[in-house]
């Protein structure tokens, strides 16, 4: 049985302040059952960036249609980037449970923010 892979193809992404950043993530399998969440940073202090089920993330939208069947693309787009958004973003697969259990993280994508061209 092949192990699930969480693939973040870009090690780094550079975006001008005010633009949108696309952070790519795909998974290799629909199972195990459980959600994908995005975080900035690692460890216990990490910041939740996107979780479709809970919270309000007005600047974050999924790249692919959230109603698409059996889709394995969990890329997100963050709008109106500011220098405060810089950091390393992780796409994380959870196994469904009570509570959900972290199963595997992508390697991370470092977002750097360039000054807005004058």
């Amino acid at each position: 049985e092949e192990e699930l892979q969480v693939i973040q193809p870009e090690k780094s992404v550079s975006v001008a302040a005010g633009d949108s950043a696309t952070l790519n993530c795909t998974v290799s399998s629909l199972i195990p059952v459980g959600p994908i969440q995005w975080f900035r940073g690692a460890g216990p202090g990490r910041e939740l960036i996107y979780n479709l089920k809970e919270g309000h993330f007005p600047r974050v939208t999924p790249v692919s249609d959230p109603t698409k069947r059996n889709n394995m693309d969990f890329s997100i787009r963050i709008s109106n980037i500011t220098p405060a958004d810089a950091g390393t973003y992780y796409c994380v697969k959870f196994r469904k449970g009570s509570p959900d259990v972290e199963l595997k993280s992508g390697a991370g994508t470092e977002l750097s923010v360039r000054a807005k061209p004058s």
Partner: antibody, heavy 120, light 108 residues
Framework: EVQLLESGGGVVQPGGSLRLSCAAS????????VTWVRQAPGKGLEWVST??????YYADSVKGRFTISRDNSKNTLYLQMNSLRAEDTAVYYC???????????????WGQGTLVTVSS | EIVLTQSPATLSVSPGERATLSCRAS??????LAWYQQKPGQAPRLLIY???IRETGIPARFSGSGSGTEFTLTISSLQSEDFAVYYC??????????FGGGTKVEIK
């Protein structure tokens, strides 16, 4: 064409055991979660159990008595039912899960069901 | 556990008329709701998922609407083959997946 074919139903005494099978074809079985749903005579649908890869989920009403498993090499889903009770009498359907990417699962293909009757 | 309440339990409709079926969730399920049709002696068949998206091959007379806690399945002009029992199912918060008690659509 997706097909799901259940077998193994029958009449069993209370406290007895039964093993249901569901043979799947027409899709990449190992890539999808699969589920058992049952329907008591004249009643509505009741979710029983779901299996992903190693992950398994059960309704409280069957937890500790039923075990779901799969054999991807045989494209087959199983439900081992122990300590059966009269209230387990139902048609048992296997169903293929379909997922909306950021969300949960629903059931896009169903077998025709197999009847389990628990009676002395 | 999220409880789904379907109403009415039975709906008597003449062929060609419109049928409106309701499904109410005990808590917010966003759009994570499916509708199934079941005819006597047959397995359920998926009609609608994500509250409003018709499954491939389902006629356009079937439509789903609603979000949060209130959902509706509408059959715009009932055909003879549409007389059946209809179930809603939530997949927002599980286990357990839960189904409504069903609405039987019968010929008036």
């Amino acid at each position: 064409e997706v097909q799901l074919l259940e077998s193994g139903g029958g009449v069993v005494q209370p406290g007895g055991s039964l093993r249901l099978s569901c043979a799947a074809s027409g899709f990449s079985f190992s890539n999808f979660a699969v589920t058992w749903v049952r329907q008591a005579p004249g009643k509505g649908l009741e979710w029983v159990s779901t299996i992903g890869s190693g992950d398994t989920y059960y309704a409280d009403s069957v937890k500790g008595r039923f075990t779901i498993s799969r054999d991807n090499s045989k494209n087959t889903l199983y439900l081992q039912m122990n300590s059966l009770r009269a209230e387990d009498t139902a048609v048992y359907y296997c169903a293929k899960d379909s997922t909306v990417s950021w969300s949960g699962d629903f059931f896009d293909y169903w077998g025709q069901g197999t009847l389990v009757t628990v009676s002395s | 556990e999220i409880v789904l309440t379907q109403s009415p339990a039975t709906l008597s409709v003449s062929p060609g008329e419109r049928a409106t079926l309701s499904c109410r969730a005990s808590q917010n399920v966003k759009n994570d709701l499916a509708w199934y049709q079941q005819k006597p002696g047959q397995a359920p068949r998926l009609l609608i998922y994500a509250a409003r998206i018709r499954e491939t091959g389902i006629p356009a007379r079937f439509s789903g609407s609603g979000s949060g806690t209130e959902f509706t399945l509408t059959i715009s002009s009932l055909q003879s083959e549409d007389f059946a029992v209809y179930y809603c199912q939530q997949y927002y918060d599980w286990p357990p997946f839960t189904f409504g008690g069903g609405t039987k659509v019968e010929i008036k």
